[in-house]
């Protein structure tokens, strides 16, 4: 079982390979000096049907370096960054993992593109492995709450309460959504 020639790349190069390209072979892409690689640099020859070989993902692309490009902080509810830090310049990558009891859909890494957007794929999503969700928490008088998403919230996520200036928070500042679908505490209050 072998793979066909790896997809070509403009303004870059492909690592050395011999033919036939055996299943398990890795080829690596890199870009010429004034270009930045967007996408996974390594492709793997795999077989899905034990008959034909195929490349496990599309080839990355080489974008002409834009020194003015910068991307916003990428947010993945239920997930966290394991690689990458601000500022995010053209060609920088960020890799995500999901919190405990969440599973990832999509590609774990994204790249800052010349158009100031993350790509070449969408940001991954972290989905709760528990079907239960916690109901939306109420707002509190003279205060606010920040949640990682709107409406009902998946186990493992949390809501943080804060009070307006001149008010004191009484109770728990951070309330966690438990795997039982219940909140870890009742909402706090803001008192003068």
């Amino acid at each position: 079982i072998s793979c066909g020639s790896p997809p070509p790349i403009l303004n870059g190069r492909i690592s050395y390979y011999s033919t036939p390209i055996a299943v398990g072979t890795v080829i690596r892409y890199s870009c010429s000096g004034t270009f930045r690689l967007i996408g996974e640099k390594s492709l793997l020859c795999i077989t899905k049907d034990k008959v034909d070989g195929t490349w496990d993902k599309p080839a990355p692309k080489c974008e002409y370096f834009n020194k003015y490009s910068s991307c916003p902080e990428p947010i993945v509810p239920g997930g966290y960054k394991i690689r990458g830090s601000t500022p995010y310049r053209h060609g920088d990558s960020v890799t995500f993992a999901c919190k405990t009891n969440f599973s990832m859909n999509g590609n774990k890494s994204v790249w800052c593109q010349a158009n100031n957007m993350w790509g070449p794929t969408r940001l991954p999503t972290c989905v709760s492995v528990f079907p239960l969700e916690c109901p939306a928490l109420p707002m509190i008088h003279n205060g606010h709450h920040t949640s990682e998403n709107v409406g009902s919230i998946a186990p493992g996520l949390s809501v943080t309460y804060s009070c307006e200036s001149g008010y004191l928070l009484v109770g728990e500042k951070i309330i966690n959504c438990l795997s039982s679908g219940k909140w870890s505490a009742v909402p706090p209050t803001c008192e003068e």
Partner: antibody, heavy 119, light 106 residues
């Protein structure tokens, strides 16, 4: 950091086989590749082969083709290297090493397993 | 197989001084090169990958450079714990290691 713990030292007769295990803990076993690298006494490092556990794909260095078999058990996060038709020059420390995804370089190494081939 | 050649085989340097280790590839390997440090009785430890990127937790005194066929590992100011054997490894086409450079105290 992923920890790789290998099985203990082995003494084998020429012509026999040896099977060394490498148990991974931490990280996701399915998201990395495990290579086997050996080091004869006082010598350098020699790549033997590699497996991608999630796919069950193993590839071997030309020198060891037909004599080495690398397998993985996803349920126990353990990789195995079996070397057959042992000869005295196979006496070495055998290491398992992990590369994240298919990066090509080894972030984590097992502690090594000494295999001595002697009559 | 891509043959990797390291030089010198042994390098004698005094603590506090700079050490420069070389690695040559038998064919172009772009920047697909890693450096490892190995002390007696221990497994190798990743220092540098992609020719010049320091691995997590590696001190700034270690730096890597080069591309194509010529690569260098530089240790700017040698500490006592840096005396060890150093290996380069290519991953352009499968994997292969250099024969090692032993860095010893002068």
């Amino acid at each position: 950091q992923v920890q790789l713990v290998q099985s203990g030292a082995e003494v084998k007769k020429p012509g026999s086989s040896v099977k060394v295990s490498c148990k991974a803990s931490g990280g996701t076993f399915s998201s990395y590749a495990i290579s086997w690298v050996r080091q004869a006494p006082g010598q350098g490092l020699e790549w033997m082969g590699r497996i991608i556990p999630i796919l069950g794909i193993a590839n071997y260095a030309q020198k060891f083709q037909g004599r080495v078999t690398i397998t993985a058990d996803k349920s126990t996060s353990t990789a195995y290297m079996e070397l057959s038709s042992l000869r005295s020059e196979d006496t070495a420390v055998y290491y398992c090493a992990r590369e994240e995804d298919i990066s090509g370089y080894y972030q984590d190494w097992g502690q090594g397993t000494l295999v001595t081939v002697s009559s | 197989e891509i043959v990797m050649t390291q030089s010198p085989a042994t390098l004698s340097v005094s603590p506090g001084e700079r050490a420069t280790l070389s690695c040559r590839a038998g064919q172009s390997i772009s920047h697909y090169l890693a450096w490892y440090q190995q002390k007696p009785g221990q497994a190798p430890r990743l220092l540098i990958y992609d020719a010049s990127t320091r691995a997590t937790g590696i001190p700034a005194r270690f730096s890597g450079s080069g591309s194509g066929t010529e690569f260098t590992l530089t240790i700017s100011s040698l500490q006592s714990e840096d005396f060890a054997v150093y290996y380069c490894q290519q991953y352009e086409y499968w994997y292969s290691f250099g024969q090692g450079t032993k860095l010893e105290i002068k």
